[in-house]
Interface confidence: medium
Amino acid sequence: SIPWNLERITPPRYRADEYQPPDGGSLVEVYLLDTSIQSDHREIEGRVMVTDFENVPEEDGTRFHRQASKCDSHGTHLAGVVSGRDAGVAKGASMRSLRVLNCQGKGTVSGTLIGLEFIRKSQLVQPVGPLVVLLPLAGGYSRVLNAACQRLARAGVVLVTAAGNFRDDACLYSPASAPEVITVGATNAQDQPVTLGTLGTNFGRCVDLFAPGEDIIGASSDCSTCFVSQSGTSQAAAHVAGIAAMMLSAEPELTLAELRQRLIHFSAKDVINEAWFPEDQRVLTPNLVAALPPSTHGAGWQLFCRTVWSAHSGPTRMATAIARCAPDEELLSCSSFSRSGKRRGERMEAQGGKLVCRAHNAFGGEGVYAIARCCLLPQANCSVHTAPPAEASMGTRVHCHQQGHVLTGCSSHWEVEDLGTHKPPVLRPRGQPNQCVGHREASIHASCCHAPGLECKVKEHGIPAPQEQVTVACEEGWTLTGCSALPGTSHVLGAYAVDNTCVVRSRDVSTTGSTSEEAVTAVAICCRSRHLAQASQELQ
Amino acid sequence: QEDEDGDYEELVLALRSEEDGLAEAPEHGTTATFHRCAKDPWRLPGTYVVVLKEETHLSQSERTARRLQAQAARRGYLTKILHVFHGLLPGFLVKMSGDLLELALKLPHVDYIEEDSSVFAQ
């Protein structure tokens, strides 16, 4: 038997004999910004180099006694979780520790910034292989700490951080709220979000994924052969740092965007009991528990996509929300969601030379979310084609007319406050799969992409009587790039992608008095890349 | 006491090396902003990260920090530059009175200023 947390992150095919690929992160260096550590603990001896970096505030209280084992407790345990010889995730990874937290586990934003700068300077002086930086700490939202993380990420460093232990929206904390950082929440052996006293793991759209973070056995600084069980989002982040080290060791050329997409792709899906989260956060919180990939070989053939939710727009009439993809990702579709159903749709628009997804609130609405579908599509050339409101009874349509361009997503946006009920033909005319259809009073936007070997198809699931939720999923080998609803009438709250499933939510029929004529159809666009598949076959 | 003497010495040097006038006045229309932690108990007033505009060179960061010290000294305030950032973000970390924030926000090259705050092991 192995500890529950190591078993949980291990794909079934390893469980029989060795639980991980052999090299175990040996090409990767993991920086740990935390407390001091006991580097001669037998779990981490020879694996962790203690740098001379130290920037910590004075301990609080006049009667505080520095006790080495207590000062080293947090950092030693995390170093053990990342690379410990017996209880570590990436047993081959080498680590470097920087002391930014004092003996009470407290540090400062400025000390952390100086630590991040130290790492960047070390990287410039002596470039090594892939770098992972583990930040098992959290403070209040900090523009400067997030900016420093962004700069370091853009220099090719993978940053992994704790979501925070405040049972709160992770977007209110830093560095958890930095979009470039991989933010990790904590789950337990029952795949429940971790409760820590009266608080617990943070949640929300700023969390990328969850990982084991309760009752994690690791190195204890009490003695060199001691182990301790600790809990928290730090422990969860340490698991992901270890998994990242394993992935980067197998594929050292992976970019941050590629690594994040792989972490999401190989995670266990829909295993977390979402009832633990506040109701308004459930849809925003990823239901993903990190796991190692089932093979050390890359999954380059796969078309990887993820869903990115915007911040809430706020309730004013003209309020908008914007969801952005990472620099290396393509925005392949854009949708919107409003709990009240009062929204004016969404559109893809250029901002700073990159497409973003903008959702529009409606008068009397409580606010909207924009939902971007962000994908890794090398050599892609994407553009948005727009058709203004048709006013015709057949509804508005737009298609991809450029040679070799395929439809990856449909959006619709309207200026009127409330779209009347209107039933456009749900099935599009044969031979025209590259077409978006929408309400006659709406502008329709088609995301059209050209990429080597890219092929897409439209999949629909319509339910004659209105339902609170309609879903349609892409089959094995295909990736969901677009998710939208037909028709765009006011009882539709919106559409969003959850993993490979398109979810369309409608208002509770009992409260709206909707008629059975108002059918709702979930429209999924499923794509795959023959080019990527061929390339990976040639490599093997 | 020794520390304070060191600070005064540093300030006198800063004063001598700075001209009185505001050369390099802040660009028109761009207003630097001030940020602080929303969670009051985590705030660390008295220490500030002054973040400069993206393309600012190290020499300009040092010059801006010296200018802040000189202008603060003229108003009778003691300041201490704790660190000059370069490599990730241009800027500097300064220990000073919150009374000087308005002055600091008007310095050339300043993008925004953030009050230092606590972070915690999770």
């Epitope: 407790s73 209880a87 060199s224 052969t225 001691c226 182990f227 301790v228 069980s229 | -």
Partner: antibody, heavy 131, light 106 residues
């Protein structure tokens, strides 16, 4: 007091494998807290590996990595040591020994001390490797 | 691996003598050291653990001291049943034993 009783002497050919068992009787026994130590004729003691009781993971000395497998069967209170690719220099007396694991509460957490302190030993099993 | 060096490798002594055996570690091991006694054809027997704590049932003439890299086993008054081989063993890293000290009758 725990008694550790080992299986009988074995004669093996070079290249083959041997599996020695160690059964506990009397007292409470954590079959995970077992190490194996060998002693070549006229030589000193050499630790081969053991099962880490806290993690339930076998831990092996560098020298034996890949050649030794240590397992434990809770239901029969028996630990096993299998050594493969035997060579003549593997001729030795093989001992199983119980090592210590202490668990104490600390700072609201459990700290586990893994101590390779061998208080109980089996009688030893002579393994002779000869062609 | 941590190397353990015992000295002397053998010694001759008489009943009633005070005998001292030393053990040096190749690096600091705190007080993570045990001492064992082994008689011919028998399994080793634990005498002292954690550098200086006497295992229950072991006569008080045996004592241990030291920490870091240098350790000592002392038999205050040698008895006839004490003639045997003595081993030190560290457990700060993976366990390693000293090469042994044979205590013979003079």
């Amino acid at each position: 007091q725990v008694q550790l009783v080992q299986s009988g002497a074995e004669v093996k050919k070079p290249g083959s494998s041997v599996k020695v068992s160690c059964k506990a009787s009397g007292g409470t026994f954590n079959s995970h807290a077992i190490s194996w130590v060998r002693q070549a004729p006229g030589q000193g003691l050499e630790w081969m590996g053991g099962i880490n009781p806290i993690l339930g993971i076998a831990n092996y000395a560098q020298k034996f990595q890949g050649r030794v497998t240590i397992t434990a069967d809770e239901s029969t209170s028996t630990a096993y040591m299998e050594l493969s690719s035997l060579r003549s220099e593997d001729t030795a007396v093989y001992y199983c020994a119980r090592h210590y694991e202490i668990q104490i509460g600390r700072y609201g957490m459990n700290v586990y001390y893994l101590m390779y302190r061998f208080a109980s030993w089996g009688q030893g099993t002579l393994v002779t490797v000869s062609s | 691996d941590i190397q353990m060096t015992q000295s002397p490798s053998s010694l001759s002594a008489s009943v009633g003598d005070r005998v001292t055996i030393t053990c040096r570690a190749s690096q600091g091991i705190r007080s993570a050291l045990n001492w064992y006694q082994q008689k011919p054809g028998k399994a080793p027997k634990l005498l002292i653990y954690n550098g200086s704590t006497l295992q229950s049932g072991v006569p008080s003439r045996f004592s241990g001291s030291g920490s870091g890299t240098d350790f000592t086993l002392t038999i205050s008054s040698l008895q006839p049943e004490d003639f045997a081989v003595y081993y030190c063993q560290q457990f700060d890293g993976d366990p390693t034993f000293g090469q042994g000290t044979k205590v013979e009758i003079k």
